[in-house]
């Protein structure tokens, strides 16, 4: 799986919440960022994430689709120079400072159940998705026999009207 261009085909800001409407929030603690899954109070502001979409070519010998086997990869950046990374050894999702070109661990294959309900599959570990475990984000293995609609790996994207990236 190779990214076909160094520039994203589109980017937009959105807030990220779980299928059960808990918010994904990011807090700077001891010079590193922590990721939380929590209920927000009624008027509390949701954290925004910059989603960058990249086209990725699936190797034609694997897909049988020739040049046509394309998928969408996404990177998620809640604040400048920091991106969500898959730590496949620890089965964890972490926020790391990175420079471009980003490492493969920062890319996730996008799946969606509808336009604003999505799942993120680790590029470096197919079949493993960002999910919610004990009020934290974690990497969760989804058997191919299971339906991807399993709620703990589904996230909602809600639009934001702010066009800056904090």
């Amino acid at each position: 799986m190779s990214i076909t261009g160094i520039s994203p085909i589109t980017e937009y800001l959105a807030s990220l919440s779980t299928y059960n409407d808990q918010s994904i929030t990011f807090a700077l603690e001891d010079e590193s960022y922590e990721i939380y899954v929590e209920d927000l109070k009624k008027d509390e502001k949701k954290d925004k994430v910059l989603l960058s979409y990249y086209e990725s070519q699936h190797p034609s010998n694997e897909s049988g689709d020739g040049v046509d086997g394309k998928m969408l990869m996404v990177t998620l950046s809640p604040t400048k120079d920091f991106w969500l990374h898959a730590n496949n050894k620890e089965h964890s999702v972490e926020l790391h400072k990175s420079e471009k070109p980003l490492p493969d661990q920062a890319f996730f294959v996008l799946h969606n159940m509808h336009s604003n309900s999505v799942s993120f599959e680790s590029k470096t570990d197919p079949g493993v998705f960002i999910g919610v475990k004990d009020n934290h984000l974690a990497l969760i293995k989804v058997d191919s026999s299971e339906n991807l609609s399993t709620e703990n790996i589904l996230f909602k994207l809600s639009e934001t009207h702010h066009h800056h990236h904090h």
């Epitope: 085909i9 699936h58 998928m71 969408l72 336009s115 604003n116 339906n147």
Partner: antibody
Framework: EVQLVETGGGLVQPGRSLKLSCVAS????????MYWIRQAPGMGLEWVSS????????YYLDSVKGRFTISRNNAENTVYLQMNSLRSEDTATYYC??????????????WGQGTLVTVSS | DIQMTQSPSVLSASVGDRVTLSCKAS??????LDWYQQKVGEAPKLLIY???NLQTGIPSRFSGSGSGTDYTLTISSLQPEDVATYFC????????FGQGTKVEIK
């Protein structure tokens, strides 16, 4: 080469049923969302229904909900549209289309040539 | 539901002209917008996806732009083979087509 071939259209009386089929070839069918889009004579395009790659999620235009059912058979590379309780306003060319990317509901990258459904007594 | 409004309904221009088609969404659609071309008697064809990305095999005289609720398809130099109806389409929330703009040669 990607190909989508629709069949099953024809003349049908109001209230009756019809089942459209779309056979796909030239790509890994089970990786893509599939869609039905229709176009009444001389009119614009109207999205009708969507089904995700594993068939677990389906979506419908409000005016066809409860009457139309989209389904797919990934082993046979085929997507279906079962149309019940047909009305004169369902008269249209029905196109089958394939998503642009694996696993996502974004864009209709490939279209069939369409099959005409005429609902008339 | 998101409504998509295209203007003008019909556009008549000369060969070589720069042509601009407009599409307005009832809500912010986050650049989740395509443009399709449909010639008489043919199935529609994807021209532009995600607002400004040219589909493989489409001539570079076609380009797209926009954000939020306002989007544009531009044909930099109109050719006789561009005579068609052009539809915008959003997939940010559900799936909705605009009513189309018919492009004719003067």
């Amino acid at each position: 080469e990607v190909q989508l071939v629709e069949t099953g259209g024809g003349l049908v009386q109001p209230g009756r049923s019809l089942k459209l089929s779309c056979v796909a070839s030239g790509f890994t069918f089970s990786n893509y969302w599939m869609y039905w889009i229709r176009q009444a004579p001389g009119m614009g395009l109207e999205w009708v229904s969507s089904i995700n790659n594993d068939g677990g999620n389906t979506y419908y235009l409000d005016s066809v909900k409860g009457r139309f059912t989209i389904s797919r058979n990934n082993a046979e590379n085929t997507v279906y549209l079962q149309m019940n309780s047909l009305r004169s306003e369902d008269t249209a060319t029905y196109y089958c289309a394939r998503g642009h990317y694996y696993y996502t509901s974004y864009s209709f990258a490939y279209w069939g040539q369409g099959t005409l459904v005429t609902v008339s007594s | 539901d998101i409504q998509m409004t295209q203007s003008p309904s019909v556009l008549s221009a000369s060969v070589g002209d720069r042509v601009t088609l407009s599409c307005k969404a009832s809500h912010n659609i986050n650049k989740h917008l395509d443009w399709y071309q449909q010639k008489v008697g043919e199935a529609p064809k994807l021209l532009i996806y995600f607002t400004n990305n040219l589909q493989t095999g489409i001539p570079s005289r076609f380009s797209g732009s926009g954000s939020g609720t306002d989007y544009t398809l531009t044909i930099s130099s109109l050719q006789p083979e561009d005579v068609a109806t052009y539809f915008c389409f959003q997939y940010n929330s559900g799936w909705t087509f605009g009513q189309g703009t018919k492009v004719e040669i003067k």
